[in-house]
């Protein structure tokens, strides 16, 4: 890995190498300055593997609301607007980090958690299983 | 919003409502128990809107490595294996939370940061702009 020279102005901590419990400032800094979120908002409908977004809410998690994609069909939409079952719609998934309140219901104590979310769908050529 | 009854066993904190600085345990709990990540690992190649994955590394961020998808073509792959420019490959983007070391180079002090990442690509019907 890359060794980072330690900043002498860091808060005190017992473990100087890789901390297990750290301080996190929840004032979110948003780096997404050059993007137009509206541009991608209709892809779910225009895609050949369209999807719907479902709201997943959990007050014990931060962020408490996550949107999950579910592919509408097993096949993909062809040029005529019909579902073509020679192709497969599949979810594109990503592991993301969230904060889980620990102990439960605590406002200022969390644990990092990895969850798998489905972000959208893509159309793929099926895997052909050859029977011997 | 949902009011959560406060757990009496919570660590002390000055702000009882919505903390700006919290304690986070970095021992990651992985909730992805029922998934097989290998199943989706070849979608980038089998998709009609294939993509390449680029490694984005930043030692001041946690996680330090994030993989970014970049669509291979402007169009989509048709049944003959050629690029069809009557359709568009577009990135599916998602806002994710990461931890940014703050002050810089500190091992135990972070700030939450939102970044936009491209997870994969999907094939969409183009928006047709009619000229008056």
């Amino acid at each position: 890995g890359i060794t980072i020279p330690r900043n002498p102005g860091c808060p005190n901590s017992e473990d100087k190498n890789f901390p297990r419990t750290v301080m996190v400032n929840l004032n979110i800094h948003n780096r997404n300055t050059n993007t137009n979120p509206k541009r991608s908002s209709d892809y779910y409908n225009r895609s050949t593997s369209p999807w719907n977004l479902h709201r997943n809410e959990d007050p014990e998690r931060y962020p408490s609301v996550i949107w999950e994609a579910k592919c509408r069909h097993l096949g993909c939409i062809n040029a005529d607007g019909n579902v073509d079952y020679h192709m497969n719609s599949v979810p594109i998934q990503q592991e993301i980090l969230v904060l889980r309140r620990e102990p439960p219901h605590c406002p200022n104590s969390f644990r990092l958690e990895k969850i798998l979310v489905s972000v959208g769908c893509t159309c793929v050529t099926p895997i052909v299983h050859h029977v011997a | 919003g949902i009011t959560i009854p406060r757990n009496p066993g919570c660590p002390n904190s000055e702000d009882k409502n919505f903390p700006r600085t919290v304690m986070v345990n970095l021992n990651i709990h992985n909730r992805n128990t029922n998934t097989n990540p290998k199943r989706s690992s070849d979608y980038y190649n089998r998709s009609t809107s294939p993509w390449n994955l680029h490694r984005n590394e930043d030692p001041e961020r946690y996680p330090s490595v994030i993989w970014e998808a970049k669509c291979r073509h402007l169009g989509c792959i048709n049944a003959d294996g050629n690029v069809d420019y009557h359709m568009n490959s577009v990135p599916i983007q998602q806002e994710i939370l990461v931890l940014r070391r703050e002050p810089p180079h500190c091992p135990n002090s972070f700030r939450l940061e939102k970044i936009l990442v491209s997870v994969g690509c999907t094939c969409v019907t183009p928006i047709v702009h009619h000229v008056a």
């Epitope: 409908n45 719907n52 977004l53 479902h54 709201r55 997943n56 999950e68 994609a69 579910k70 592919c71 509408r72 069909h73 097993l74 096949g75 579902v83 079952y85 497969n88 719609s89 599949v90 979810p91 998934q93 489905s118 769908c121 793929v124 099926p126 895997i127 052909v128 299983h129 | 029922n34 998934t35 199943r39």
Partner: antibody, heavy 124, light 113 residues
Framework: QVQLQESGPGLVKPSETLSLTCTVS????????VSWIRQPPGKGLEWIGI???????DYNSAFKSRVTISVDTSKNQFSLKLSSVTAADTAVYYC??????????????????WGQGTLVTVSS | DIVMTQSPLSLPVTPGEPASISCKSS????????????LAWYLQKPGQSPQLLIY???TRQSGVPDRFSGSGSGTDFTLKISRVEAEDVGVYYC?????????FGQGTKVEIK
């Protein structure tokens, strides 16, 4: 508990539009999709169409040109409209909830809760 | 449209005895990406609306007794009742949810001998 209740006129004249309402309770509309199914007297079940949680629809192509499914979230109501009806549209019409499975990344077309059904007769 | 063919169309049964219903699809219901078969079974009791018994070929819906079991893959599927009870009478339907429109079998009427 989960409940779905169909309502509407029991008699419709040929060439007119059949209009039915499905009032639901006991589940979250933003999570679940709802389908309409019909059953002609003494016959089997026929899927008419679905309205997804976001208001999008998908119809059986046999009905496509004359069916409309919509939702009024504020009233917890779904509606079915079938235009230009004939005697062949006489049936018991059901609304049913599409199953929602967490950690499953496709819309689900299994129907895990049904209304009691309403008989619509097309006759002059 | 996918044709779902059930047999038999009528099944007289004796309480306590096993029963079996077959359902054949005109196309495979096995999705290669997740190896799931998109087939469900419903029971419509006399004067009632249908109720979901089994989905994905063999997963029992919550509250369904374990005497009901489903099996099969591809185009051939079976619903078995290990020991028929009087309350099991009605019409059983299979349904495919792979291809739109989502179609049902013509139904199998189970009645007590």
């Amino acid at each position: 508990q989960v409940q779905l209740q169909e309502s509407g006129p029991g008699l419709v004249k040929p060439s007119e539009t059949l209009s039915l309402t499905c009032t639901v309770s006991g589940f979250s509309l933003p999570s679940h999709s709802v389908s309409w199914i019909r059953q002609p007297p003494g016959k089997g079940l026929e899927w008419i169409g679905i309205i997804w949680n976001n208001g999008g629809t998908d119809y059986n192509s046999a009905f496509k040109s004359r069916v409309t499914i919509s939702v009024d979230t504020s009233k917890n109501q779904f509606s079915l409209k079938l235009s230009s009806v004939t005697a062949a549209d006489t049936a018991v019409y059901y609304c049913a909830r599409n199953m929602y499975i967490t950690d499953y990344y496709y819309e689900n077309y299994f129907l895990d809760a049904w209304g009691q059904g309403t008989l619509v007769t097309v006759s002059s | 449209d996918i044709v779902m063919t059930q047999s038999p169309l009528s099944l007289p049964v004796t309480p306590g005895e096993p029963a079996s219903i077959s359902c054949k699809s005109s196309q495979s219901l096995l999705f290669s990406e997740n190896q799931k078969n998109y087939l469900a079974w419903y029971l419509q009791k006399p004067g009632q609306s249908p109720q979901l018994l089994i989905y994905w070929t063999s997963t029992r819906q919550s509250g369904v007794p374990d005497r009901f079991s489903g099996s099969g893959s591809g185009t051939d599927f079976t619903l078995k009742i290990s020991r028929v009870e009087a309350e099991d009478v009605g019409v059983y339907y299979c349904q495919q949810s792979y291809y739109t429109p989502y179609t049902f079998g013509q139904g199998t009427k189970v009645e007590i001998k």
